[in-house]
């Protein structure tokens, strides 16, 4: 631990003004893994002025970094990129007359303290001010920068002309594509000062690839593919003052894919469990030795998870029979195709025939409508009747 | 020597726009922050905006905050303040100052006259 | 916001006479940098304002050595050791450390 500071597991506090601390603490090799500090407590070290780009990089762990009544004039761009567990930053009372929003940009910090440094007044601070009137909290902090007079302005009164948030106005056609088709988006941004822009594709799957000039640019997605529905893409313009970004949600439409389908489990209901992708929703027809099933309140399709385009669920059976084995198929269909398959189901064995027998399944199924418990309703194959068995439950609503 | 005129004051009604100018002469103006004072029917004294001397900020009291804009054009020795939303309590003398480097207002020119009245 | 108070409001003196003006500050005024930007500024009759001390005590230029300023953190005076015809007019204190800057509300000498 070095000297003028006191260590434990979690924390580091350095508070002794003499002899002080010259350099952010660091510990030696041997000693508490860095990455179980959480906190960082400096106060009182007036020869502290500079926080450099590795100095604060070995301790991943850390949530509170407070640094007061110190000398800190300089925090390098890079300081925080690997501490992305940083909350709360207090920097009361030092010595900075700048700081850039880009040292925080990627954390999400619920908290960071600047009272009291003698920023200078100019469009580099700008942002600290668009994050105080952002937050409107009633604790909202009396920032100043110092005139050319260097006296105290609070940034609220400041108002600094050229200076402002940028715009991002990204020009979308109609973003529901084909799978395998191809797509450009365009993007144009305005501010001054005059912003950078660039594309935010998140986890895109599909191949793209952009052109981008200072205030125009373009991005060209090709061979789209299906797991990319429902991904947001957007446009962002950044300058010294803050961000603005500019979305679309990329809607694929696909033909359907049955992705699994197994044999049928007991639980509380018996299950022939399935997964179907497709966008548009694809419909769900069940054919039972290749005759139509006509779903009743019996045997009926209930979707579970909606996973976007992606639907998982099971054709549910109550109390089913030996009259309901045999093979099941499930067609899913939407305007771009169609996918069927087929499992077979055995429930249980016929009476007085040992169930490890496993008898051929029954060519005739007994219409009995008065057997409420395995009413399967009419199968026999009626090609006038396909009901429309949309991915949803009786009550018409999606699970 | 030092020279600040302002012009531009007239009768406005409220809700209105005026536009105040200062010409500055007899020293290097885009060297000096420069400020507006003015001051009431009463003689009370108020100050008003003030811009720094490359013009890349301005500030304000909060009486007149988000209603008053100031700016300047240093080729030209000119100094502007734009009032809108005017009220009858901006109804005043206004000078245009020249802050010293210290801070205080050592020159100030001869007052424009607003008067804010339906 | 600093409330700048003077007194008195009207001062009758003779020529030759001494004169004194006092200004106290609702707060200190002394600025974080150290500085005490209290200032007096005198307005004869159908003039402008003119500035006469700055930071408490220092005489602008071209001033006359009868005016002296003194004070600290929250009462300041203004001192005119013989006053002369051209001295009448209206003196305003000014406090330029805490934001937003302030005036006295006056303080008006008269010949008697």
């Known amino acids: 631990c070095p000297t003028s500071c006191k260590c434990s597991a979690s924390r580091i506090w350095c508070s002794d003004p003499s002899p002080g601390i010259v350099a952010f603490p660091r510990l030696e090799p041997n000693s508490v893994d860095p990455e179980n500090i959480t906190e960082i407590f400096i106060a009182n070290q007036k020869r502290l002025e500079i926080i450099n780009e590795d100095d604060v990089e070995a301790y991943v762990g850390l949530r509170n970094l407070t640094i007061v009544d110190s000398g800190l004039k300089f925090v390098a761009h890079k300081a925080f990129l690997k501490n992305s567990n940083l909350q709360h930053i207090n920097f009361t009372r030092n010595k900075l007359t700048s700081l850039s929003r880009k040292h925080f940009r990627h954390l999400d910090l619920s908290e960071l303290i600047l009272v009291g440094n003698p920023f200078t007044c100019s469009c580099d601070i700008m942002w600290i001010k668009t994050l105080q009137e952002a937050k409107s909290s009633p604790d909202t902090q009396d920032l100043y920068c110092l005139n050319e007079s260097s006296k105290n302005i609070p940034l609220a009164n400041l108002q600094i002309p050229n200076c402002g948030l940028p715009s991002a106005n990204l020009a979308a056609p109609n973003l529901t594509v084909e799978e395998g088709k191809s797509i450009t988006l365009s993007c144009s941004v305005a501010g001054d000062p005059v912003p950078n822009m660039y594309w935010d594709v998140g986890n895109l799957v599909s191949k793209h690839m952009n052109e981008t000039s200072h205030t125009q640019g373009s991005l060209r997605i090709t061979n789209i593919s299906s797991d990319d529905s429902g991904k947001q893409i957007s446009c962002v313009a950044e300058n010294l003052v803050g961000e603005d970004q500019d979305s679309v949600n990329l809607t694929v439409h696909f033909a359907p894919t049955i992705t699994f389908l197994e044999s049928p489990t007991s639980d509380h209901h018996w299950c022939i469990p399935f997964t179907v992708k497709g966008n548009p929703k694809p419909a769900l027809q069940w054919f039972y030795n290749g005759a139509i099933l006509n779903e009743s309140k019996y045997i009926c399709t209930k979707i579970h998870v909606t996973n976007h385009t992606e639907y998982h669920g099971c054709l549910q059976l109550d109390n089913p029979t030996h009259m309901n084995n045999g093979d099941y198929t499930l067609i899913a269909k939407n305007e771009y195709g169609k996918d069927e398959k087929q499992i077979s189901a055995h429930f249980m064995g016929w009476p007085g025939i040992d169930d490890g027998a496993n008898p051929n399944y029954p060519d005739v199924i007994y219409e009995d409508y008065g057997t409420a418990a395995n009413d399967i309703g009419d199968t026999t194959n009626r090609s006038n009747e396909i009901p429309s068995t949309d991915v949803t439950d009786k009550t018409g609503r999606e699970h | 020597d030092v020279k600040l005129v302002e012009s531009g004051g007239g009768l406005v009604k409220p809700g209105g726009s005026l536009k105040l100018s200062c010409a500055a002469s007899g020293f290097t103006f885009s060297s000096y922050t420069m400020s507006w004072v003015r001051q009431t029917p009463e003689k009370r004294l108020e100050w008003v905006a003030t811009i720094s001397s490359g013009g890349d900020y301005t500030y304000f009291p909060d009486s007149v905050k988000g209603r008053f804009t100031m700016s300047r054009d240093n080729a030209k020795n000119a100094l502007y303040l734009q009032m809108s939303s005017l009220k009858s309590e901006d109804t005043a003398m206004y000078y245009c100052t020249r802050e010293s480097g210290r801070g205080d207002f050592d020159y100030w020119g001869q007052g424009t006259t607003l008067t804010v009245s339906s | 916001d600093v409330l700048m108070t003077q007194t008195p409001l009207s001062l009758p003196v003779s020529l030759g006479d001494q004169a004194s003006i006092s200004c106290r500050s609702s707060q200190n005024i002394v600025h974080s940098n150290g500085n005490t930007y209290l200032e007096w500024y005198l307005q004869k009759p159908g003039q402008s304002p003119n500035l006469l001390i700055y930071?408490?005590?220092n005489r602008f230029s071209g001033v006359p050595d009868r005016f002296s300023g003194s004070g600290s953190g929250t009462d300041f005076t203004l001192k005119i050791s013989r006053v002369e015809a051209e001295d009448l007019g209206v003196y305003y204190c000014?406090?330029?450390?805490?934001?937003?800057?302030?005036f006295g509300g006056g303080t008006k000498l008269e010949i008697t």
């Open positions: 930071n408490v005590s």
């Open positions: 000014f406090q330029g450390s805490h934001f937003p800057w302030t």
